[in-house]
C-alpha cells in the first residue's frame, strides 16, 4: 500500500503560523493578509508505526522540499530539527523513528508527540517570532496544541 499524504498548514492554539527561519528552522508568529502566504505547507504522510487509542503515526515533510521534521539528541536533550533527505526515497512507509510523530487529534486540536522521545511534543513559545522546538512539558507555558488547515494539492 503506497504512502498516503495530505497537504496542510499548522497554527498553534494562539493562531500563530509557522514560517521558515533560515534554511533549517521554523518559527511561529502571527500573520495576516498576504503575509499568510509565507506559512509553510506540510506534506503530512501517514506511516507505519505504533497505533494506540488516539495516536496516528505521521511524518511531517515540507511540501516540495526535501526537508522533514526530525527529533534527535543534541547535548543530551531531545531536539527538533529540519533534516534534508534524498527525495527519491522519501516519503516511505517505514520512516526512521526520528521522523515519526504520534498525531493526537481530539476535538480538532492536534498534538505531535515524538515517537523517538515519548512525552516530548512539537511546541511553540508564547512569545512572537520564536523557534518551533521539541518541548518536554504539556499544559505549561509552552504551546503544544495546533489546528490543521487542509491545502489542496
Amino acid at each position: 500500500a503506497p504512502v498516503r499524504s495530505l497537504n496542510c498548514t499548522l497554527r498553534d492554539s494562539q493562531q500563530k503560523s509557522l514560517v521558515m527561519s533560515g534554511p533549517y528552522e521554523l518559527k511561529a508568529l502571527h500573520l495576516q493578509g498576504q503575509d499568510m502566504e509565507q506559512q509553510v505547507v506540510f506534506s503530512m504522510s501517514f506511516v507505519q508505526g505504533e497505533e494506540s487509542n488516539d495516536k496516528i503515526p505521521v511524518a511531517l515533510g515540507l511540501k516540495e522540499k526535501n526537508l522533514y521534521l526530525s527529533c534527535v539528541l543534541k547535548d543530551d536533550k531531545p531536539t527538533l530539527q529540519l533534516e534534508s533527505v534524498d527525495p527519491k526515497n522519501y516519503p516511505k512507509k517505514k520512516m526512521e523513528k526520528r521522523f515519526v510523530f504520534n498525531k493526537i487529534e481530539i476535538n480538532n486540536k492536534l498534538e505531535f508527540e515524538s515517537a523517538q522521545f515519548p512525552n516530548w511534543y512539537i511546541s511553540t513559545s508564547q512569545a512572537e517570532n520564536m523557534p518551533v522546538f521539541l518541548g518536554g512539558t504539556k499544559g505549561g507555558q509552552d504551546i503544544t496544541d495546533f489546528t490543521m488547515q487542509f491545502v489542496s494539492s
Epitope: 507505519q48 487509542n53 496516528i56
Partner: antibody, heavy 118, light 106 residues
Amino acid sequence: QVTLKESGPGILQPSQTLSLTCSFSGFSLSTSGMGVSWIRQPSGKGLEWLAHIYWDDDKRYNPSLKSRLTISKDTSSNQVFLKITSVDTADSATYYCARSAYYSFAYWGQGTLVSVSA
Amino acid sequence: DIVMTQSHKFMSTSVGGRVRITCKASQDVDTDVAWFQQKPGQSPKLLIYWASTRHTGVPDRFTGSGSGTDFTLTISNVQSEDLADYFCQQYSSYPTFGAGTKLELK
C-alpha cells in the same frame, strides 16, 4: 479505549444483499489518517480482507469481490457499513471490522456470524 | 494477488519449548508483514507488525523476523496460553493473509 462491534442479519438466503454495521467508540473517523476495514473468516478457515474506508472517504476493495461490495461510513454516528450483493453459501462466515491507520489491524471487533442458507 | 503460504497447518510443541512458524510471500513484500494470534471463538490479536516490531503489550517471547519473501514468527518459552492459530498477513499491496498454523501441545 477503542472498541468495535459488528452487527448483521445472522441468516439470509442466496441472492439477497447482506448489510453489515460496525459501531465503534474510542476514536473518530474524522481523524486524519484513520481507517476501518471489513475482514471475514469462514468457519475453520483463514482470513479474507474485503474493504477499507479512510477518514477522507477514500475506499479500497478486494479486487476479486469489488463488483459486489460497497463500503460507507457515517462519521457523526461512529459507524461503518458494508453491503455485499448476490450472496451465496460461500459468503457464510464471521465478519469482522478492524481499525487501522495502516493495514496492520491493531483493533478488532468480536465478529458477527452470517449464514447463507436456502 | 500476493499469496502468503504457511506451509505447516499444524505445529506441536511442549510448554517451555521454542517454535518457529514460517510464512512465504509469493513476491517481495519488503517488511510489510504482520502476525496475528487467534484463539477459538475470539477475534485475531495483532502480535507483530513491520515483520519484527512487537505490538504494545505483546510478551517478548514473541519475535518476528524476515524480509522480502520469507518470514518467521518465533515463540520462545511457549506457555499454555500460546496454543492458538497464528496468521501472517502482508500489506505491501491490498491485504492478504496466510491460511494459518495451529500450535498444539505435543
